[in-house]
């Protein structure tokens, strides 16, 4: 029987009964948070052979081995993983061995076995026979191997029953427990599985089989399972499902879901039956089971039950991630926050249509509304009292609405209202009237000319750059000296610059009123000599990198018709010079004949310009005389070079550390102090452990029901 979609057994060990008839778990298996030590010996699930996703064990008291629970678990497919892992055994206080003696294949993903204080028989398992790559395995913080004394079957009687393999240069017996060897197939089978009697299975079998060379006798399938047969691909008119079996259209149409998107059922796309169309595709009609590519970003309609969605934090904005059409009203009230502009853009940047009104009030953290970078239509189907569909009130730092040169926004119905936005120039509001088609709708009091822009330099003069000079990591720029009507009103200049691979940046990108700014800022004092043009040397730049630069004059509040006069430049794009590239990466050389070497490498990580050619140099080396000192035809006494591995077993250092100089015959040495790289690696390791533990806790702890 197929069970699924994922089984979560927690708190009560008797829930294990749910596994009674399962042969395949289509999904994951969690066994976790069983704090009372129980006797698991009466629980045995010999039918279970395959888990299609992952197996997670966490804090199950009293469980000493998995071998009795799952004696025939053969394959964990890892179709979906738990933080890159297909097998996670974490904080299992009483587990003494894994014992999954029939586990032959973990198709995808790595293993993480961590913080299991009593767990042994880890060094006796050759994971390379089960996984394709063992480099991502994480086996840390378990019982130290020296305290385990792991013995494979028959070793004590000097009649070893298990086969040997080499791990980390150690050739040793491989077993799961004191009485269970790790199964290995004859080398004649190659990558194929084998029966208990070491006969090779059919190539489409995975893990094991009950009869040789028979695609109907597989315990699990390498590719797909259909009508009792293992097949390399799903037959016509059938579709891949959950990465392991083939189903027909009728089956796919009749899958019921408890996910919010279920109203339209599963879809068939690219030969697969799946819950929703993949990224970049949309259903071909509301009741269709097929997907077509989206034109531009895929539409996603989001609706607010209470009609008005209040955005007062990043968390509330998060709910709108991916939404392109918002059915309802948006009330934006962002008083504070960290890196708020880019966070809001991340979560609200795809919204194209708001069906109701948009109200922005008391949002002192906002400098611009450019985070709504795709908003093109406000329908105004619902309006605020007074027939307003765009309402902007008391935003102390709002300076820009949108970049109107690159923005089309239509307000279909309703008026606009602006008041108490001291840094928002009225000219910016008038420009919005023109672009949105609301000109003439507003009455006189709707756009207050006295309290909008009262603290902004709205009548801006343009500063012109006069010269630019570049080197590989510096830019020197100068600009015309700005001369306001009263020279004393000019205090200084501020130069803003940042990397800009494309010529599409605006002044307000990534900027908010709480200190976050994607621009680097440098203050430039006025030159004492009135005839000298102001300028700056920007240094510490990257070679062959395009930068955007603009300059603003910092002026006193010089009122002219109730408004401050200021000056700023256009944005200038300028590229630093090329430089020497960093070294080519991953250089490998191999000989394919007696007179040829093949050398391969990867491009440098920092090309610092356009790479046009590589220079390869080589020289002849003298032959190592060491190779001639032994007759390699004799079997005995082949010299073994022993290299110091530079590690020290901390647990063994019990006496006071010696302080003599290393080398010679002076005895034990001190551990060398850790290099910066080692310290950094340790720090990253600790950080990685924390990240995983947080992920684990966040994934599995759920609030109790009300």
């Amino acid at each position: 029987e197929i069970c699924g979609p994922g089984i979560d057994i927690r708190n009560d060990y008797q829930q294990l009964k749910r596994l009674e008839n399962c042969t395949v778990i289509e999904g994951y298996l969690h066994i976790l948070l069983i704090s009372k030590a129980e006797d698991y010996r009466s629980y045995r699930f010999p039918k279970l052979t395959v888990i299609t996703e992952y197996l997670l064990l966490f804090r199950v008291a009293g469980l000493e081995s998995l071998g009795d629970l799952f004696p025939n678990l053969t394959v964990i497919r890892g179709w979906k993983l738990f933080y890159n892992y297909a097998l996670v055994i974490f904080e299992m206080t009483n587990l003494k061995d894994i014992g999954l003696y029939n586990l032959r294949n973990i198709t995808r993903g790595a293993i993480r076995i961590e913080k299991n204080a009593d767990l042994c028989y880890l060094s006796t398992v050759d994971w390379s026979l089960i996984l394709d790559a063992v480099s991502n395995n994480y086996i840390v913080g378990n019982k130290p191997p020296k305290e385990c004394g792991d013995l494979c079957p028959g070793t004590m009687e000097e009649k070893p029953m298990c086969e040997k393999t080499t791990i980390n240069n150690e050739y040793n017996y491989r077993c799961w427990t004191t009485n269970r060897c790790q199964k290995m197939c004859p080398s004649t089978c190659g990558k194929r599985a084998c029966t208990e009697n070491n006969e090779c299975c059919h190539p489409e079998c995975l893990g094991s089989c009950s009869a040789p060379d028979n695609d109907t006798a597989c315990v699990a399938c390498r590719h797909y399972y259909y009508a009792g047969v293992c097949v390399p691909a799903c037959p016509p008119n059938t579709y891949r499902f959950e990465g392991w079996r083939c189903v027909d259209r009728d089956f796919c149409a009749n899958i019921l879901s408890a996910e919010s998107s279920d109203s339209e059922g599963f879809v068939i796309h690219d030969g697969e039956c799946m819950q929703e169309c993949p990224s970049g595709f949309i259903r071909n009609g509301s009741q269709s089971m097929y997907c077509i590519p989206c034109e531009g970003p895929c539409p996603k309609v989001c609706e607010e039950e209470k009609k008005t969605k209040t955005i007062d934090s990043v968390t509330s904005a998060q709910m709108l991630q991916g939404c392109t059409i918002f059915k309802g009203n948006l009330l934006i009230n962002i008083r504070r926050g960290n890196n708020i502009a880019s966070e809001l853009e991340n979560f609200m940047g795809l919204i194209e249509v708001v069906t109701g009104y948009v109200k922005i009030r008391h949002s002192h953290a906002l400098v611009s509304l450019s985070f709504l970078k795709n908003l093109r239509l406000i329908l105004g189907e619902e309006q605020l009292e007074g027939n307003y569909s765009f309402y902007v009130l008391d935003n102390q730092n709002l300076q820009q609405l949108w970049d109107w040169d690159h923005r089309n926004l239509t307000i279909k119905a309703g008026k606009m209202y602006f008041a108490f936005n001291p840094k928002l120039c009225v000219s910016e509001i008038y420009r919005m009237e023109e672009v949105t088609g609301t000109k003439g709708r507003q009455s006189k009091g709707d756009i207050n000319t006295r309290n909008n822009g009262e603290r902004a330099s709205c009548e801006s003069d343009v500063l012109h750059f006069t010269s630019t000079t570049t080197s590989k990591n510096r830019i020197i720029i100068t600009w015309h000296r700005y001369r306001p009507p009263d020279y004393r009103d000019l205090i200084s200049f501020t130069v803003y610059y940042k990397e800009a691979p494309f010529k599409n940046v605006t002044e307000y990108d990534g900027q908010d009123a709480c200190g976050s700014n994607s621009w680097n800022m440098v203050d430039v004092d006025l030159p004492p000599n009135k005839d000298v043009e102001p300028g700056i040397l920007l240094h510490g730049l990257k070679p062959w990198t395009q930068y955007a630069v603009y300059v603003k004059a910092v002026t006193l509040t010089m009122v002219e018709n109730d408004h401050i006069r200021g000056a700023k430049s256009e944005i200038l794009y300028i590229r630093t010079n090329a430089s020497v590239p960093s070294i080519p990466l991953d250089v490998l050389s191999a000989s394919n004949s007696s007179s040829q070497l093949i050398v391969k490498w990867n491009p440098p990580s920092l090309p610092n310009g356009n790479l046009s050619y590589y220079i390869v140099r080589w020289q002849r080396q003298p032959q190592d005389g060491y190779l001639y000192r032994h007759n390699y035809c004799s079997k005995d006494k082949i010299p073994i070079r022993k290299y110091a591995d530079g590690t020290i077993d901390i647990e063994e250092v019990t006496e006071n550390p010696k302080t003599e100089v290393c080398g010679g015959e002076k005895g034990p040495c001190c551990a060398c102090p850790k290099t910066e790289a080692e310290k950094q690696a340790e720090k990253e390791e600790a950080e990685y452990r924390k990240v995983f533990e947080n992920f684990l806790h966040n994934s599995i702890f759920v609030p109790r029901p009300e």
Partner: nanobody
Framework: EVQLVESGGGLVQPGGSLRLSCAAS????????MSWFRQAPGKEREFVSA????????RYADSVKGRFTISRDNSKNTLYLQMNSLRAEDTAVYYC????????????????WGQGTLVTVSS
């Protein structure tokens, strides 16, 4: 853990109607696909009907199509089965079952089960 309690069973004449209810407690009701199964004396347990988490999609066994209607009220945490035009072969113990996230057509191993309610169709 989810607790399911069925009610509404009883004796009814052929051609008559009955409405079964299943009250759920313990977890967010809408996050489960809900089903009705039945087991007649001396027979295997068989699938009757299932409904998606939102209630927007249903599935029925061929033997009950057009006669039975499954529905749910997520605000009341309750599943219903309206049974019309009842026949003698509908006599069975009816079980309510819940499965998290989704249910494929071949799924019989639901995560949670009720104790069952007996429906007898006889003249």
């Amino acid at each position: 853990e989810v607790q399911l309690v069925e009610s509404g069973g009883g004796l009814v004449q052929p051609g008559g109607s009955l409405r079964l209810s299943c009250a759920a407690s313990g977890r967010t009701f809408s996050s489960f696909v809900m089903s009705w199964f039945r087991q007649a004396p001396g027979k295997e347990r068989e699938f009757v009907s299932a409904i998606s988490g939102s209630g927007s999609r249903q599935r029925y066994a061929d033997s009950v199509k057009g006669r039975f209607t499954i529905s749910r009220d997520n605000s009341k945490n309750t599943l219903y089965l309206q049974m019309n035009s009842l026949r003698a072969e509908d006599t069975a113990v009816y079980y309510c079952a819940a499965n998290p996230r989704r249910a494929t057509p071949d799924l019989s191993q639901y995560a949670y089960w009720g104790q069952g309610t007996l429906v007898t169709v006889s003249s």
